[in-house]
């Protein structure tokens, strides 16, 4: 992807000195809209089958400083009568993120990029029974 | 947190200046380690009560170029036959990221952080229903 | 502008719960956390919890755990704090206060509410 | 959880003065520490964050500085209009914990 972009204008850059050394400013766009997360419901962590809490990750070293992370609340799914199925289990969905890590010790300050890998919510799967040989 | 250190060393920077002006190193490093991927099984869009599909979202200027996008497959979730139960509705998971985007005609290039939510994955809950006063 | 406008006054009785509101306005409610804050003369300022209205996460003070339960309504961009079993001990002035969770500070309160707990 | 130790209780100016709060953290906290200032019948506001960071819009008579345990928090030329109480807050980490505020009069 053109992330190096060349121009007239712009003296050739090795990618490696400029991926390890790239200007960013950290004012927060939305680049959907600032309706963006209306469209997020709330209350599906509480009414899925497969409900989930979230616990509030926080690091002060870490742009975003706060991330909450989801757990799923049974190991199996809730059917229509509100108990638990034990023919379906609860999996957590986990996507790949990006965050910013200020290097320790770095004036003027530096940050690395880091990939986290965190809990989005729950979803209900059917258990896979193994059948013997 | 402490996205702004200051230390004897640094001298005292006004917030607005130093938000539009970090450095960051764009290698990427995994905090959860190399292996960070292989804990994600990709079946669970498949298996799901609430199936997904996943779309690949591009665009050279942003860092990452790619991302997966997930759109629910049906509107309502599938039961134990296979069919769609008319009760239980499937409803996307969104999650906020963290993306940086180039700044255009930016040189020596700089890139500005955006917020982007992003469907992760579908779940099922119980369609509500709504009373007649 | 951002602002977060807090309910009046209240006066109630020893036992009794209360459901205190912040409303928020001037911004998109489910970008930012709201937490809650505790005044008393004697004991000063203390955190009791946060929410954050777009995806309904809360996390308490271990102290204040079993006394509120925060709540959110996008609809009307108002978050709630109820305090139960109330006690004497309970009288304080309660703020809202928003926090950038990119950025890692609070930046706005709500002028607070005073809740006095007697028979 | 972090205790936040804030002096003087109460400092008693004339206009003009220059005025220093000190807070001390129990623990280190980077450099996440916010300043606010509350009059009556108002809402707290924001003047410094990370510790040293000016807040939009604050006048440049209010400085803060420190890193680690130990914070300041200056109003150079002290006006009518900064009668007020000030704390301090840190946010490195919840529970969020506060100093216990300084009441400045003027005389």
């Known amino acids: 992807a053109a992330i190096i972009p060349q121009s007239s204008a712009c003296p050739n850059t090795e990618a490696k000195d400029f991926l390890q050394n790239v200007k960013v400013n950290l004012k927060v766009f939305n680049s959907l809209g600032a309706k963006v997360s209306s469209r997020r419901p709330s209350d599906y962590l509480n009414r899925s089958t497969s409900p989930w809490t979230l616990h509030r990750n926080e690091d002060p070293d870490r742009y975003p400083s706060v991330i909450w992370e989801a757990q799923c609340r049974h190991q199996r799914c809730v059917n229509a009568e509100g108990k638990l199925d034990h023919h379906m289990n609860s999996v957590l969905i986990q996507q790949e993120i990006l965050v910013l890590k200020r290097e320790p010790e770095s004036c003027p300050f530096t940050f690395r990029v880091e990939k986290m890998l965190v809990g989005v919510g729950c979803t209900c799967v059917a258990s896979i029974v193994r059948q013997a040989a | 947190a402490a996205i702004i250190p200051q230390s004897s060393a640094c001298p005292n920077t006004e917030a607005k200046d130093f938000l539009q002006n970090v450095k960051v190193n764009l290698k990427v490093f995994n905090s959860l380690g190399a292996k960070v991927s292989s804990r994600r099984p990709s079946d669970y869009l498949n298996r799901s009560t609430s199936p997904w599909t996943l779309h690949r979202n591009e665009d050279p200027d942003r860092y990452p170029s790619v991302i997966w996008e997930a759109q629910c497959r049906h509107q309502r979730c599938v039961n134990a036959e296979g069919k769609l139960d008319h009760h239980m509705n499937s409803v996307l998971i969104q999650q906020e990221i963290l993306v940086l985007k180039r700044e255009p005609e930016s040189c020596p290039f700089t890139f500005r952080v955006e917020k982007m939510l992003v469907g992760v994955g579908c779940t099922c809950v119980a369609s509500i229903v709504r009373q007649a006063a | 502008q951002v602002q977060l406008q807090q309910s009046g006054a209240e006066l109630v009785r020893p036992g009794a719960s209360v459901k205190l509101s912040c409303k928020a306005s001037?911004?998109?409610?489910?970008?930012?956390?709201i937490h809650w804050v505790k005044q008393t003369p004697v004991h000063g300022l203390a955190w009791i919890g946060v929410?954050?209205?777009?995806?309904?996460?809360?996390a308490y003070n271990q102290k204040f755990k079993d006394k509120a339960t925060l709540t959110a309504d996008k609809s009307s961009s108002t978050a709630y704090m109820e305090l139960s079993s109330l006690t004497s001990e309970d009288s304080a002035v309660y703020y809202c206060e928003r926090f950038l969770t990119y950025e890692g500070y609070f930046d706005y309160w709500g002028q607070g509410t005073t809740l006095t707990v007697s028979s | 959880s972090i205790v936040m130790t804030q002096t003087p209780k109460f400092l008693l100016v004339s206009a003009g003065d220059r005025v220093t709060i000190t807070c001390k953290a129990s623990q280190s906290v980077n450099n996440d520490v916010a300043w606010y200032q509350h009059k009556p019948g108002q809402s707290p506001k924001l003047l410094i964050n990370?510790?040293?960071n000016r807040y939009t819009g604050v006048p440049d008579r209010f400085t803060g500085s420190g890193y680690g345990t130990d914070f300041t928090f200056t109003i150079s030329t002290v006006q009518a209009e900064d009668l007020a109480i000030y704390f301090c807050?840190?946010?490195?980490?919840?529970?969020?914990?506060f100093g216990g505020g300084t009441k400045l009069e003027i005389k």
């Open positions: 929410i954050h209205p777009g995806n309904g996460g809360t």
């Open positions: 990370y510790a040293s």
């Open positions: 001037g911004y998109t409610f489910s970008d930012y956390e």
């Open positions: 807050q840190q946010d490195y980490g919840s529970p969020y914990t």
